[in-house]
């Protein structure tokens, strides 16, 4: 049971960061206009992943797309691919995990794939969220190098009256978004790995049986329990896992078939 | 057909308060900002303070900073300039102005404006 | 306070003749954020409220006659009348529209000559 529901409990927040992935790269406050120690000014400016957009004290909002795709910077084009490969690979986890878990049934497919089903999509979780916590600490380190290189020449002048006051932008809500949404990923993805350790067959004495020295007898034991033997080396309780093809009543894996609501 | 229409002007003594009225019509007052602006006889125009649709966000001039007090009521389609501890300094026409939408925050309709005279 | 700088303070053109006023700011009023200059022209007759002609620096407000165009960025701004009508006669000003407090110019007082 405990398996089941961790098994669950990680599609289920890898689903939520998955979701918050996917909305912190489609969100346009990654970066926002630092308000604190500045000017007050009657726009606000804030920029995303895909585009920039002004708001201005009229409420009117207006945002440009970033069309060039060879103008933009280097570290930009790095986070806009971290966040896609995190969003595919946690697609594609999702689609691999539905089918792992426990509680939903497709033909007679055994534990040990539907283990290795577990395994894989809580690594691609795993790698998902990883993806999406880099892509937004390399934005965010991005933004403070730029906002500390323009402190350093916040007014740049030509000489004289005239000023050019430097927007400084800080971090987004976007960036919040992000690194939880990559954490409840990873979270999730960790749990699909400890669901996969609980999932995966352990080997089980199927044909234990067991000889007494008197030969009246002859105690099965099925089910890998230990029979009382009467002598010899040989007849200590050696798991035996076989591999091969079950009935559909040997097939009662740690919670039972029943446990599926 | 906007139109925006300022009342309560007159003359107070300095130190004394007024409050002046700006009544609007023709447009969906609460979707726009507005900003008064004075000037005083002869001079020209000095912007005075801002209130944003909702009234979240009121700016004031430095000058009428601690002294004068914007407000709106969105359901009577009306806004309200308080002006406490009057100067003579403060003797002007007052307009109110709307905000543009899509005007880069320009003003876009002008009040006829309504005189306050401070004076002994 | 970004301080607006308009010259000249009175300016007398003939009719029918071209007249330009500049106005200068302290700080450069193009908004890094989208490109977009921050400028407002306003006319103001006697006796009479002002009248918004230009904002963003050169987008002419609805009703404005297409004699009238802005121009500039930064700092450096120009209102041009292309040729100019009685009707024309009035005081113009420019004012910041990015930064609080929204400054105006001093005024420019256009009459024919």
């Known amino acids: 049971m405990a398996v089941t529901a961790c098994q669950g409990l990680g599609f289920v927040v890898s689903l939520i960061g998955i979701a918050g992935i996917i909305a912190a790269t489609c969100m346009d406050q990654w970066s926002t206009q630092d308000l604190y120690n500045n000017p007050v000014t009657a726009v606000f400016n804030y920029q995303g992943l895909w585009r920039s957009c002004v708001r201005e004290s009229s409420g009117f909002t207006e945002c440009r797309g970033y069309f060039t795709l060879l103008g933009l910077p280097a570290m930009l084009q790095a986070v806009r691919a971290l966040m896609i490969v995190g969003i595919v690979l946690g697609a594609i986890g999702l689609l691999v995990s539905i089918f792992a878990l426990k509680c939903i049934r497709i033909g007679s497919m055994e534990d040990s794939a539907k283990a290795n089903m577990t395994l894989t999509s809580g690594i691609m979780f795993i790698v998902s969220g990883l993806c999406a916590i880099a892509g937004v600490s390399v934005f965010a380190n991005m933004l403070v190098t730029n906002f500390w290189m323009s402190t350093a020449n916040m007014y740049t002048g030509m000489g004289g009256m005239v000023q050019t006051v430097q927007t400084r932008y800080t971090f987004g809500a976007a960036l919040f978004v992000g690194w939880v949404a990559g954490g409840l990923t990873l979270i999730g993805g960790v749990m699909m790995c400890i669901a996969c350790r609980g999932l995966a067959p352990e080997e089980t004495n199927y044909k234990a049986v067991s000889y007494h020295a008197s030969g009246h007898s002859v105690a099965y034991k099925p089910g890998g329990f230990k029979a009382s033997t009467g002598f010899g080396s040989n007849t200590k309780n050696k798991k035996i896992y076989d591999g091969g093809a079950r009935t559909e009543d040997e097939v009662q894996s740690y919670p039972s078939k029943h446990d599926y609501v | 057909e906007v139109q925006l229409v300022e009342s309560g002007g007159g003359l107070v003594q300095p130190g004394g308060s007024l409050r002046l009225s700006c009544a609007a019509s023709g447009f969906t007052f609460s979707d726009y900002g507005i900003h008064w602006v004075r000037q005083a006889p002869g001079k020209g125009l000095e912007w005075v303070a801002y209130i944003s649709r909702g009234s979240s966000t009121i700016y004031y001039a430095d000058t009428v900073k601690g002294r004068f007090t914007m407000s709106r009521d969105n359901a009577k389609n009306s806004l309200y300039l308080q002006m406490t501890s009057l100067r003579a300094e403060d003797t002007a026409v007052y307009y109110c102005?709307?905000?543009?939408?899509?005007?880069?925050?320009?003003?876009?309709?002008w009040g006829q404006g309504t005189t306050v005279t401070v004076s002994s | 306070d970004i301080v607006m700088t308009q010259s000249p303070d009175s300016l007398a053109v003939s009719l029918g003749e071209r007249a330009t006023i500049s106005c200068k700011s302290s700080?450069?009023?193009?908004?890094?954020?989208?490109?977009?200059?921050?400028l407002a022209w306003y006319q103001q007759k006697p006796g009479q409220p002002p009248k918004l002609l230009i904002y963003g620096a050169s987008t002419r407000a609805s009703g404005v006659p297409d004699r009238f165009s802005g121009s500039g960025s930064g700092t450096d701004f120009t209102l041009t009348i292309s040729s100019l009508q009685a009707e024309d006669v009035a005081v113009y000003y420019c004012q910041n529209d990015l930064y609080y407090p929204l400054t105006f110019g001093q005024g420019t007082k256009l009459e024919i000559k």
């Open positions: 102005a709307r905000g543009g939408y899509d005007t880069r925050n320009a003003m876009d309709y």
């Open positions: 700080q450069s009023l193009l908004n890094s954020g989208n490109q977009k200059n921050y």
